[in-house]
């Protein structure tokens, strides 16, 4: 018996073939010997079955022996043994029908569950692996998890069905609700603009929910929200912002806000969360800022940061063009009566200077 | 494509010294912090010594303190590291590696070179 | 120095098997750990930075997790080639230390 597997919803085409390339008689008939559908000369006849709307041959086909069986729509419940009669001949075909569908959503929030449910007809035992957008390959029976979904799962699953040594491909499309970035940090002078960005991972055509800013100053003891927001179809409106500061937010996608300037008691980390209109959880991103403050006060010029660094950044002042008069792993650095000229701040690390601040020192007279 | 090539290893005694260099090809030498790791024969990796972009900052595991000197010459694409003094616990696989810097937040030892072996006998 | 110390020192799996690595800090490092795997007469090979971050072109069976002073590294689904040494690196302040590793060998 010849065993084909259909996908719910596709069509199928069953074939069915007669020793003589001509126009004869054949009867599609289910198992239960009802029939589905015929000919009558060049004319198709259809018969009681279920199958009655969804069925249909290729007359163009007839003349060549050929008596195809069309099933439209299929359905999980059309998984049954076809028989083709022509030519006092039996062909038999078993066709069995798999739906393979996720089961919420198919926009799912970073770290949250995919289960993928295989539909298989009564008496089916397949197997089903699935394999991810970045290569990821899970295996199951009739049900498939994934814990902890990442930005990479986003795209298209490719799950293939196996029954009978033979293979049917669902293709599913996963979006996974993410910012692009799950944490940035912004190095920036004392007074200078201040720009967070928060670009998502993901576009859909309407865009709806509520968002905060909270932010934790290195100088403070407690957190505080800085700003409240509203979306709607990817239109952002200020619902509630502090008076200090007065932060300024976009009114379109990607989600900007602006700090007026960057001060000592701004520097520290904030945590944007952002929760989707029919989704349980919050999307969250975080973001940080070090400030970095030159001074001259008398004889003594002092460079410090503010904010989250990694303890192996090291903070320099040094004279234009000369070697660093002073150098450390902390977060201030100062030079007694420095000598005249154009000094230069630098935060660095192993790669790079992350943020510079130039300071004239006026000759003494 | 990005590449490092150890070489200057070999057998030498306990007491003397050895400079190892390290070829860097494939990118832009001077904007990486670049590394010496090791491994002695049955043992795991040792973190030796860090030199930054510029030459300016180096910092060694305190096994090799005032014994290795790590430096570089960014118009030769080349890291050294001279090591003196030698002991035969300094016998091991010595690699090269570079360190990427993300927003000076994320750090990591991204492209190794093959190694070369360094023998300290008597 | 900040001491690293990994578990198990060896371990003893099958193809298909999922496998935990855990390392310790002796004090916070934040999110500053990576995860390498070493073969014998190769190159180390980086999997993870940043504790939780796949590097490019690390196949997505490797994960890595944690902050502060303990981090995890799982194999979901052990391939023959995974069969190797692997190390914990914190990369949070100089000097930089290495875990003991742990030596994952067939079953």
């Known amino acids: 018996k010849k065993v084909v597997l259909g996908k719910k919803g596709d069509t199928v085409e069953l074939t069915c073939t007669a020793s003589q390339k001509k126009s004869i008689q054949f009867h599609w008939k289910n198992s239960n010997q009802i029939k589905i559908l015929g000919n009558q000369g060049s004319f198709l006849t259809k018969g009681p079955s279920k199958l009655n709307d969804r069925a249909d041959s290729r007359r163009s086909l007839w003349d060549q022996g050929n008596f195809p069986l069309i099933i439209k729509n299929l359905k999980i419940e059309d998984s049954d043994t076809y028989i083709c009669e022509v030519e006092d001949q039996k062909e038999e075909v078993q066709l069995l029908v798999f739906g393979l569908t996720a089961n919420s959503d198919t926009h799912l929030l970073q770290g949250q569950s995919l289960t993928l449910t295989l539909e298989s007809p009564p008496g089916s035992s397949p197997s089903v692996q699935c394999r991810s957008p970045r290569g990821k390959n899970i295996q199951g029976g009739k049900t498939l998890s994934v814990s902890q979904l990442e930005l990479q799962d986003s795209g298209t699953w490719t799950c293939t069905v196996l029954q009978n040594q033979k293979k049917v491909e669902f293709k599913i499309d996963i979006v996974v609700l993410a910012f692009q970035k799950a944490s940035s940090i912004v190095y920036k002078k004392e007074g200078e603009q201040v720009e967070f960005s928060f670009p998502l991972a993901f576009t859909v055509e309407k865009l709806t929910g509520s968002g905060e800013l909270w932010w934790q100053a290195e100088r403070a003891s407690s957190s505080k929200s800085w700003i409240t927001f509203d979306l709607k179809n990817k239109e952002v409106s200020v619902k509630r912002v502090t008076q200090d500061p007065k932060l300024q937010m976009g009114k379109k996608l990607p989600l900007h806000l602006t700090l007026p300037q960057a001060l000592p008691q701004y520097a520290g980390s904030g945590n944007l969360t952002l929760a989707l209109e029919a989704k349980t959880g919050k999307l969250h991103q975080e973001v940080n800022l070090v400030v970095m403050r030159a001074t001259q006060l008398q004889k003594n010029l002092t460079c410090e940061v503010w904010g989250p660094t990694s303890p192996k950044l090291m903070l320099s002042l040094k004279l234009e063009n000369k070697e660093a008069k002073v150098s450390k792993r902390e977060k201030a650095v100062w030079v007694l009566n420095p000598e005249a000229g154009m000094w230069q701040c630098l935060l660095s690390d192993s790669g790079q200077v992350l943020l510079e601040s130039n300071i004239k020192v006026l000759p003494t007279w | 494509q990005v590449q490092l090539v150890e070489s200057g290893g070999g057998v030498v005694q306990p007491g003397r010294s050895l400079r190892l260099s390290c070829a860097a090809s494939?990118?832009?030498?001077?904007?990486?912090?670049m590394h010496w790791v090791r491994q002695a024969p049955g043992k795991g990796l040792e973190w030796v010594a860090i030199?930054?972009?510029?030459?300016?900052?180096?910092y060694y595991a305190d096994s090799v303190k005032g014994r290795f000197t790590i430096s570089r010459d960014n118009s030769k694409n080349t890291l050294y590291l001279q090591m003196n003094s030698l002991r035969a616990e300094d016998t091991a696989v010595y690699y090269c590696?570079?360190?990427?810097?993300?927003?000076?937040?994320?750090?990591?030892?991204?492209?190794w070179g093959k190694g070369t072996t360094v023998t300290v006998s008597s | 120095a900040i001491q690293m110390t990994q578990s198990p020192s060896s371990l003893s799996a099958s193809v298909g098997d999922r496998v935990t690595i855990t390392c310790r800090a002796s004090?916070?490092?934040?999110?500053?750990l990576g995860w390498y795997q070493l073969k014998p007469g190769k190159a180390p090979k980086l999997l993870i930075y940043a504790a939780s971050s796949l590097q490019s072109g690390v196949p997505s069976s490797f994960s890595g997790s944690g902050s502060g002073t303990d981090f995890t590294l799982t194999i979901s689904s052990l391939q023959p080639e995974d069969f190797a040494t692997y190390y914990c690196?914190?990369?949070?302040?100089?000097?930089?230390?290495f875990g003991q590793g742990t030596k994952l060998e067939i079953k």
């Open positions: 030199i930054w972009y510029d030459g300016n900052n180096k």
């Open positions: 004090q916070g490092i934040r999110n500053g």
């Open positions: 590696t570079r360190e990427v810097a993300l927003e000076g937040y994320y750090y990591y030892m991204d492209v």
């Open positions: 494939g990118f832009t030498f001077s904007s990486y912090g």
């Open positions: 690196l914190q990369d949070y302040n100089y000097p930089y230390t």
